[in-house]
């Protein structure tokens, strides 16, 4: 997937340790975040979205399809 600039406004706080889910909202400065394809074991992790692997954290994260949100894109956005 290459490199993406991720900001707290769109992706929550950036966390550093392997295994951590980054779902907080602590403001951080813009940071360059590296992604790769998700390991095969996370094939079904993102319910309504695309999986990518956050290299710094060594965890999967989801890019949700329009109309969905949540860590796994499991929730429907009723206002969409």
């Amino acid at each position: 997937d290459g490199n993406t600039t991720r900001t707290p406004e769109t992706n929550g706080s950036l966390c550093g340790a392997p295994g951590e889910n980054c779902t907080g909202t602590t403001p951080r400065q813009k940071s360059k975040t590296h992604f790769s394809r998700c390991p095969k074991q996370y094939k079904h992790y993102c319910i309504h979205g695309r999986c990518r692997f956050v290299m710094d954290e060594q965890t999967p994260s989801c890019i949700c399809e329009k109309g969905y949100f949540g860590a796994r894109c499991e929730q429907v956005d009723l206002f969409y």
């Epitope: 966390c15 392997p18 295994g19 889910n21 907080g24 390991p39 074991q41 992790y45 060594q58």
Partner: antibody, heavy 116, light 106 residues
Framework: QVQLLESGGGLVQPGGSLRLSCAAS????????ISWVRQAPGKGLEWVSY????????NYADSVKGRFTISRDNSKNTLYLQMNSLRAEDTAVYYC?????????WGQGTLVTVSS | DIQMTQSPSSLSASVGDRVTITCRAS??????LGWYQQKPGKAPKLLIY???SLQSGVPSRFSGSGSGTDFTLTISSLQPEDFATYYC????????FGQGTKVEIK
């Protein structure tokens, strides 16, 4: 500092059940994936199961699928492993470890012995 | 399932030696590989993740390399505290460990 403390191990007969617990402290438990990894006496490491931070995404090793159930209570900072239909080959030290893909902190382990 | 094969199973070395342990995956795992150190009666310790990234707090004499199916852990100058068993672990498909390599004192 990060601490993981397993409990609940012991001697159980084949076919029996046991529930392991792992109490976590020193980090925001609800933000991390957590796993169980086991090690039979004198043998290597075997990953058993993991659960994601919300408790909605779970995977198991084929060797325990259908017999073991992983769960977590984020309000209690505790991970669980319910082990049913235990076999002699389940005898091992069971570790809880922080992470789903990689394991950066481990508990000291709890010994489960399955024997008649 | 992806099988991880480590070699050698054991090795004898002296303090100051350069030690290399290899790990081969039965299919390509990109760089989804970690290395752990375990001492008798203790829990494993993560040394390397993503094949070559050094875990925080781990001495720089440890290094990892490789991608695809062939990976290497190198200890540039063996120290007394490094005598232990080392495991590789893949995390592309469901997590599996190698059988371990025991590093003993010569």
């Amino acid at each position: 500092q990060v601490q993981l403390l397993e409990s609940g191990g012991g001697l159980v007969q084949p076919g029996g059940s046991l529930r392991l617990s792992c109490a976590a402290s020193g980090f925001t438990f609800s933000r991390y994936w957590i796993s169980w990894v086991r090690q039979a006496p004198g043998k290597g490491l075997e990953w058993v199961s993991y659960i994601d931070s919300t408790g909605t995404f779970i995977n198991y090793a084929d060797s325990v699928k259908g017999r073991f159930t992983i769960s977590r209570d984020n309000s209690k900072n505790t991970l669980y492993l319910q082990m049913n239909s235990l076999r002699a080959e389940d005898t091992a030290v069971y570790y809880c470890a922080r992470g789903g893909s990689l394991f950066d902190y481990w508990g000291q382990g709890t010994l489960v012995t399955v024997s008649s | 399932d992806i099988q991880m094969t480590q070699s050698p199973s054991s090795l004898s070395a002296s303090v100051g030696d350069r030690v290399t342990i290899t790990c081969r995956a039965s299919q390509g795992i990109i760089s989804y590989l970690g290395w752990y150190q375990q001492k008798p009666g203790k829990a494993p310790k993560l040394l390397i993740y993503a094949a070559s990234s050094l875990q925080s707090g781990v001495p720089s004499r440890f290094s990892g390399s490789g991608s695809g199916t062939d990976f290497t852990l190198t200890i540039s100058s063996l120290q007394p505290e490094d005598f232990a068993t080392y495991y590789c672990q893949q995390y592309d498909a469901l997590n599996t460990f190698g059988q371990g390599t025991k590093v003993e004192i010569k």
